[in-house]
């Protein structure tokens, strides 16, 4: 384990830090320039540093769980959990799921009345009894209740002709109910006569494209529990269908652009205001389904199985029957799906803030094991056969109290988790022996808690009226800057640098801004290593016989040397054995010059001196020319012709001599003068 | 003007012990860090010690164990106990004082550890 932490001045905040943090509350386990961050480390550290081990603050994420023997069937258990955690810390419990046998059943058949429906409305008219005894061989107490569904009453939903308003069959003959979105025909009820009675009345309905209005009697069934009649048991909601259905975004065909609400708007048992929301989204409605324990099976024909096939793979305990053409079939449809569906257990929990994390190992009875899955999982399961499922919940931070509640999707039992934070520290302080503080604070964890006008390790420091922005205003470089860098303590207004863990490297300045070992490297070492240099504040001194901005350089001037062994012909300074040249003089050796100025118009009044011993410099040419000195014999150089201070034209060589405006100058004997006109 | 006279040094025998000193002047000294140099005839000179004003301290290896860097802020002086004198720890012994990236060095002491 490890323990990243950043600006930690107390146990709380080594313990949000990390799970590999932990705090010493030794005292005096800091020394002089010590920040009190170093108190804040991975258990061996401490260890390691002298904290003894009934000194290292180091508090555990834990779990305790509570039966409750109170009220009837338990499929769960334990019904509550109070987990205590600690940041980044998880704390794990188990929860069994024992499947009952004869576990209590409301069936809620939701049919589609489209035209297309017609042969299997007339068997499902006969089937109340079927479906009662079908349950009763599963359960004690079952009970059954229908609705209907069509579709939209708008174009293009459905042909909005006053005529095939009243009779929306193609069959004029055919008694036919006008379209609606959702009835709720019958309440659950265990009594089979009125689920005949009730669904004997019902007429079919017709609609004008495929689709169909099917999401949103469901969302209607599962957010009117009242109306439906819906216990707190096994909920199931067999949705008969021969097509598909409208999702959300469909329903702006028919110009209706507000979200649905997924609340309940059953007006004398119709879905009335279906005309004002948008069908629900698949999310939507798999999220209201789940929240209120709802599974529904999808009792669809051959063509369309595909389709909700798709569908149950998104909302979850859910199944797919095929269903025969005319609905002849589904009570042993149903029967199947159920068994599915009970045999597979989903643990799963409400929603959670991003603080928690919340994970599950499945450990299934037939030896299948699913791990760090982000809901439990469980195939196969049979009645009276335990399985169990760790759960594992994780805090980010230092958590509010709070609670959630798990529960197995399908079932009405529930595990109520309540969530604590985990950050305090339990200190042994001799926190009321304030002498330890100067008389001026008192000890939490190691550390001195100052009274108000006292600040300093040991409250050593009065603030004499001056607020801590002030006296920290002194530790700062400028207003941009960090306190002592970043790199200190700001006591009484001064920076007292930490001791560094990097060996060799020691923090000063006044901000302790400097220290000995940023400094640029040479071969892997700074300043290319103690041999060469030394580093002080990001600037390499180097040792004698040794240059460079690491000390990379032996210092040697060989190869600065031009024929005359002078170095960079004095033009220029020997950098690394290499030519800085002074402007415009070109390396290797500062020899030439290409682009300076030429010199001839600077020295013709000394030419005209040292040769002729007039001009403008003829009374003091020695001290007006330093740089020149007159050669006798012609010279190899710049040619120049410049007219003298007489008008007359003067021819002269210069040669350039090592240094900085140094020439050797040759001068014609014969000046070129011009007569002026007679 | 940064100043460093030092003080302390001489001839000793090996085993022995001996202490060295220096002073500085024309700077804020609580803001610096000092160090004790070495120089060996015909070596390069090294790192014996440093101290910041904080008392963070920096040894080199083989002098770790026998030489003690301490510092007075008060006094404005830095001061290098050395013990168990090898005859290796031969040198002129400078004085460093760093005042951010500007170093200035005392003019050196010799000791000498006679075998």
């Known amino acids: 384990q490890e323990c990243t932490k950043f600006k930690v001045s107390s146990c709380r905040e080594c313990i949000e830090s990390g799970p590999g943090c932990t705090w010493c509350q030794k005292l005096n386990f800091t020394g002089p320039g010590d920040p009190d961050s170093i108190r804040c480390d991975t258990r061996p550290q401490l260890l390691m540093r002298g904290c003894a081990a009934d000194d290292i603050m180091d508090p555990t994420s834990l779990a305790e769980t509570q039966e409750d023997h109170n009220g009837g069937q338990k499929q769960l258990s334990p019904q509550k959990v109070t987990l205590y955690l600690r940041p980044g810390q998880a704390a794990a419990f188990n929860v069994t799921f024992r499947r009952a046998k004869g576990y209590p059943i409301d069936l809620y058949y939701l049919m589609d009345l489209s035209y297309s429906m017609l042969d299997d409305l007339r068997n499902v008219k006969k089937l109340g009894g079927d479906l009662l005894r079908a349950l009763n061989e599963i359960t004690e107490s079952g009970r059954i209740g229908f609705g209907s569904f069509v579709d939209k009453t708008v174009l293009p939903f459905v042909n909005t002709h006053p005529d095939k308003l009243r009779n929306p069959c193609p069959n004029k003959e055919k008694e036919c109910q006008p379209p609606f979105a959702f009835r709720h025909v019958l309440k659950l009820t265990n009594n089979s006569n009125q689920f005949q009675t009730e669904v004997g009345k019902q007429l079919i309905s017709g609609n004008l494209d495929a689709p169909e209005g099917g999401l949103d009697a469901m969302m209607q069934v599962a957010a009117c529990p009242e109306e439906i009649g819906w216990r707190n048991v096994t909920r199931l909601l067999v949705f008969a269908t021969d097509d598909g259905f409208h999702f959300a975004g469909d329903g702006k065909l028919g110009a209706i652009l507000t979200p649905n609400d997924g609340r309940c708007h059953l007006e004398d048992n119709l879905y009335k205001r279906s005309n004002e929301f948008d069908y629900p989204s698949v999310g939507q409605l798999a999220h209201k389904l789940a929240e209120n324990n709802i599974q529904p099976i999808f009792a669809v024909t051959s063509r369309m199985v595909k389709t909700y096939e798709k569908l149950t793979e998104i909302i979850p305990k859910s199944a797919v029957g095929e269903l025969s053409e005319d609905s002849s079939n589904v009570v042993h449809l149903i029967k199947n799906a159920y068994n599915k569906l009970s045999s597979r257990v989903f643990l799963d929990h409400n929603a959670l803030p991003d603080t928690l994390k919340v994970t599950y190992d499945s450990f299934c009875s037939n030896g299948v094991t699913h791990r760090n899955q982000p809901r439990g999982d469980c195939d196969g399961v049979q009645i009276n056969v335990p399985i169990t499922f760790q759960v594992k919940v994780t805090a980010t931070e230092c958590i509010q109290e709070q609670s959630f509640v798990i529960r197995a999707l399908g079932f009405t039992d529930i595990v109520t988790v309540q969530v604590l934070p985990q950050c305090e520290c339990r200190c042994r302080d001799q926190s009321r022996d304030r002498s330890l503080c100067h008389g001026k604070g008192f000890l939490e964890c190691g550390i001195c808690r100052c009274d108000t006008g006292y600040i300093g390790k040991n409250c050593e420091c009065q603030t004499q009226g001056r607020s801590s922005q002030e006296l920290e205003g002194s530790c700062r470089k400028d207003n941009n800057s960090i306190i002592c860098s970043g790199l200190g303590d700001c006591v009484c207004g001064q920076c007292l640098c930490h001791t560094s863990d990097v060996p060799g490297k020691l923090i000063y300045g006044q901000y302790c801004e400097c220290d000995t070992i940023n400094c640029e490297r040479y071969n892997g070492q700074v300043c290319g290593g103690p041999g060469r240099g030394l580093c002080f504040c990001g600037k390499c001194r180097c040792h004698p016989g040794f240059e460079g901005s690491a000390c990379q350089c032996e210092r040697t001037t060989e190869g600065c040397l031009n024929p005359r062994r002078v170095e960079c012909s004095g033009r220029g300074r020997c950098r690394c054995n290499v030519c800085e040249c002074h402007s415009g003089y070109q390396l290797p050796l500062c020899q030439e010059c290409p682009g300076c100025p030429s010199p001839c118009g600077k020295y013709i009044s000394c030419a005209e001196c040292l040769k002729f011993e007039k001009g403008p410099f003829g009374k003091n040419c020695s001290a007006a020319c330093p740089g020149l000195q007159l050669s006798n014999n012609p010279v190899k150089g710049r040619t120049c012709k410049e007219r003298d201070s007489e008008g007359c034209w003067v021819a002269y060589t210069l040669e350039q001599q090592d240094g900085m405006d140094r020439y050797l100058i040759y001068v014609d004997e014969s000046r070129e003068c011009v007569a002026g006109p007679n | 003007e940064v100043q460093l006279v030092e003080s302390g040094g001489g001839l000793v025998q090996a085993g022995g012990s001996v202490r060295l000193s220096c002073a500085a002047s024309g700077v804020i000294f609580r803001f610096v860090l000092m160090g004790w140099y070495r120089q060996a005839p015909g070596k390069q000179r090294e790192l014996v010690a440093q101290?910041?004003?904080?008392?963070?301290?920096n040894y080199a290896d083989s002098v770790k164990g026998r030489f003690t860097i301490s510092r007075d802020n008060a006094k404005k002086t830095v001061d290098l106990q050395m013990n168990s004198l090898k005859p290796e720890d031969t040198a002129v012994y400078y004085c460093?004082?760093?005042?951010?990236?500007?170093?200035?060095w005392g003019q050196g002491t010799q000791v000498t550890v006679s075998s």
């Open positions: 101290i910041t004003s904080s008392d963070a301290t």
């Open positions: 460093l004082l760093a005042r951010g990236p500007d170093v200035y």
